[in-house]
């Protein structure tokens, strides 16, 4: 009886794992083995595919074959018993194009209200992704084990920290990789779960802001308790993208080590041009807080995003605010040639109730004010570009009294 060729050959490539699967053509014939040949582009001869010779099952692995993953190859298969079937040719393919990204490795660390996620490619030193190692981005799905309500986080790198979680709570997550340059989305990792710790005695510092004063950076933060010491550390932001390395060498800012105030001042030349991460930690001598949320600090933007300067024209029921370019030392205006949006906060001098206006224009009306009342105004600028999502610090507050009634015209 003539042997039939195997059919429906599927090539599955995940990272550097090359798997072939096929269907037997004739289930009734026993003791049949299968063999593959391959052919590279531009070659006439067929070569035996090592790892896929005389296979008794309907699956084989040819990962050991050192292929150029960007080069097209062709495969053929036949069945063998006493005689052999005709060859069945598989459509030619390029391994890189066919390859899927495998599940990444995930390492979790817990704090009381945060989880640190370290992500590594599933295959270390992968040949398939050798040229793309630094281009991987990741996305994750996270949920409270008790509720199952999922939150998706996109476009993260090999280290990511999720904040504002609940203490003593189990969170579960799964991660997948993507190579956006090649339109490839990977396979999810297994689900990993971790329980956040009991609430720490000392909370981390909050609301970290960087501003520029003369030739210095001023770093400010808020803290709940008095009589604390603080330290500040920085890290090059690009190091979060380093796929294999999970040793993050955070550096101390010398002028911000063991400071007793909720701010520190350090020279601009501490940082070369670049994007950095900053974090602050509090200590009372016995206990230490976890690190604050990491803020992104771009020296380029920081250097030129100064608080706006404004003038107020007071009427009885409104202020007209005219926003001008901020002044550098030496009173020269700073030219800011990128679109800004202005946030204006105003409040009655005798009250803490703040109201907010967001405006793109540089002349703004603050309506619905009471006559003969002192109002205070402060403003800050935000970049409108999402990638350079940056804010200046607030200007100093300016307080003015509204005019008597009937002067609004």
């Amino acid at each position: 009886k003539n042997l039939k060729s195997p059919q429906k050959v599927e090539v599955d490539i995940i990272d550097d794992n090359f798997i072939l699967r096929w269907n037997r053509s004739d289930e009734s014939v026993g003791n049949v083995t299968f063999s593959f040949d391959y052919q590279k582009t531009g070659m006439d001869n067929w070569i035996k595919l090592s790892g896929c010779q005389n296979i008794t099952s309907t699956k084989c692995n040819f990962s050991s074959l050192k292929l150029n993953v960007y080069e097209e190859i062709k495969l053929r298969i036949r069945a063998e018993k006493e005689n052999t079937s005709s060859w069945y040719e598989v459509d030619s393919f390029t391994p890189f194009r066919k390859a899927q990204i495998g599940p990444p490795e995930v390492h979790l660390e817990a704090e009381d209200k945060a989880i640190v996620i370290h992500i590594s490619p599933g295959t270390k030193d992968s040949v398939m992704w050798a040229l793309d190692g630094l281009s991987f981005t990741y996305s994750l799905v996270i949920w409270k084990n008790s509720s199952g309500v999922e939150e998706r986080i996109e476009n993260i790198y090999s280290r990511h920290k999720i904040y504002k979680l609940s203490p003593e709570t189990t969170y579960c997550l799964k991660v997948k990789a993507a190579l956006l340059t090649s339109w490839k989305i990977g396979v999810y990792s297994p689900v990993h779960c971790i329980k956040t710790t009991v609430e720490n005695e000392l909370p981390p510092p909050e609301n970290i802001e960087v501003s520029v004063q003369n030739q210095n950076y001023v770093l400010k933060w808020d803290y709940t308790y008095a009589n604390m010491t603080f330290q500040v550390q920085w890290l090059h932001a690009f190091l979060k993208r380093n796929p294999g390395n999970h040793l993050y060498k955070w550096k101390q800012i010398p002028d911000c080590e063991n400071v007793k105030t909720t701010q520190c001042v350090f020279p601009q030349n501490v940082f070369q041009k670049g994007i950095y991460l900053l974090r602050v930690q509090a200590s009372d001598g016995n206990n230490t807080s976890f690190w604050s949320e990491e803020i992104k600090f771009d020296t380029e933007i920081q250097a030129f995003l100064l608080p706006p300067v404004f003038n107020i024209r007071s009427l009885s029921d409104s202020f007209h605010i005219y926003i001008g370019a901020p002044k550098q030392s030496g009173n020269t205006p700073v030219i800011q040639d990128y679109p800004l949006i202005y946030e204006i906060i105003f409040w009655e001098n005798t009250s803490n109730a703040e109201r907010k206006i967001i405006e793109k224009k540089t002349d703004v009306t603050v309506p619905n004010l009471k006559p003969l009342t002192v109002y205070c105004v402060k403003a800050r600028a935000h970049t409108m570009d999402e990638k350079l999502n940056k804010s200046s610090v607030f200007s100093d507050a300016v307080c003015e009294k509204t005019k008597p009634g009937n002067t609004s015209k």
Partner: antibody, heavy 118, light 107 residues
């Protein structure tokens, strides 16, 4: 294969200084922290300090501030520990270790025995 | 500095048993705890990092657990070659600290 080879045993007089070395192979010390740990006979482990060989930044446990000085030479892939004003309390085995991923010490040297005696 | 306390200096167990070595931190260190094994006359060997992660080559009978201030190293199906001293260490802050060690004796 990652290995940390430490210098041989030292016998030194009280008040003197001693310098111990730790030569790494199988990895570049610039990519890691290099740590030093002290262990006295039949006692526990004490972390002395660490260096980032990439820029020379050091950090010491308060107890060893002024006593220990850690340096690194990236050209020879070597970290060193200098101990000054030695007393009998400094008699111990000193280990170098690599500060690896997630800050844990993943590889250790074989240890160097330092005996302070007149 | 964070103090790491291993309250049991000695523990006695038999081959095939399950034993748990405990370690308590004086303050919350998250999950930044490592465990080391030191056999007589040898240098320490890393077993566990980040409280629960086993180094490659470490037998899966070694398991780490815990977070915050309380940590445990469990050895299931104890073997004679597990006769050693076990140290915990916090790697949460720059000034790492070790526990005093727990010596495991095999009956």
């Amino acid at each position: 294969e990652v290995q940390l080879q430490q210098s041989g045993a030292k016998l030194v007089k009280p008040g003197a200084s001693v310098k111990l070395s730790c030569t790494a192979s199988g990895f570049n010390i610039k990519d890691y922290y290099m740590c030093w740990v002290k262990q006295r006979t039949e006692q526990g482990l004490e972390w002395i300090g660490r260096i980032d060989p990439e820029d020379g930044e050091t950090k010491y446990a308060p107890k060893f501030q002024g006593k220990a000085t850690i340096t690194a030479d990236t050209s020879s892939n070597t970290a060193s520990l200098q101990l000054s004003s030695l007393t009998s309390e400094d008699t111990a085995v000193y280990y170098c270790a690599r500060g690896g991923n997630y800050y844990a010490m993943d590889y250790w040297g074989q240890g160097t025995s330092v005996t302070v005696s007149s | 500095d964070t103090v790491m306390t291993q309250s049991q200096k000695f523990m006695s167990t038999s081959v095939g048993d399950r034993v748990s070595v405990t370690c308590k931190a004086s303050q919350n260190v998250g999950t930044n705890v490592a465990w080391y094994q030191q056999k007589p006359g040898q240098s320490p060997k890393a077993l566990i990092y980040s409280a629960t992660y086993r180094y490659s080559g470490v037998p899966d009978r070694f398991t780490g657990s815990g977070s915050g201030t309380d940590f445990t190293l469990t050895i299931s199906n104890v073997q004679s070659e597990d006769l050693a001293e076990y140290f915990c260490q916090q790697h949460n802050s720059y000034s790492y600290t070790f526990g005093g060690g727990t010596k495991l004796e095999i009956k």
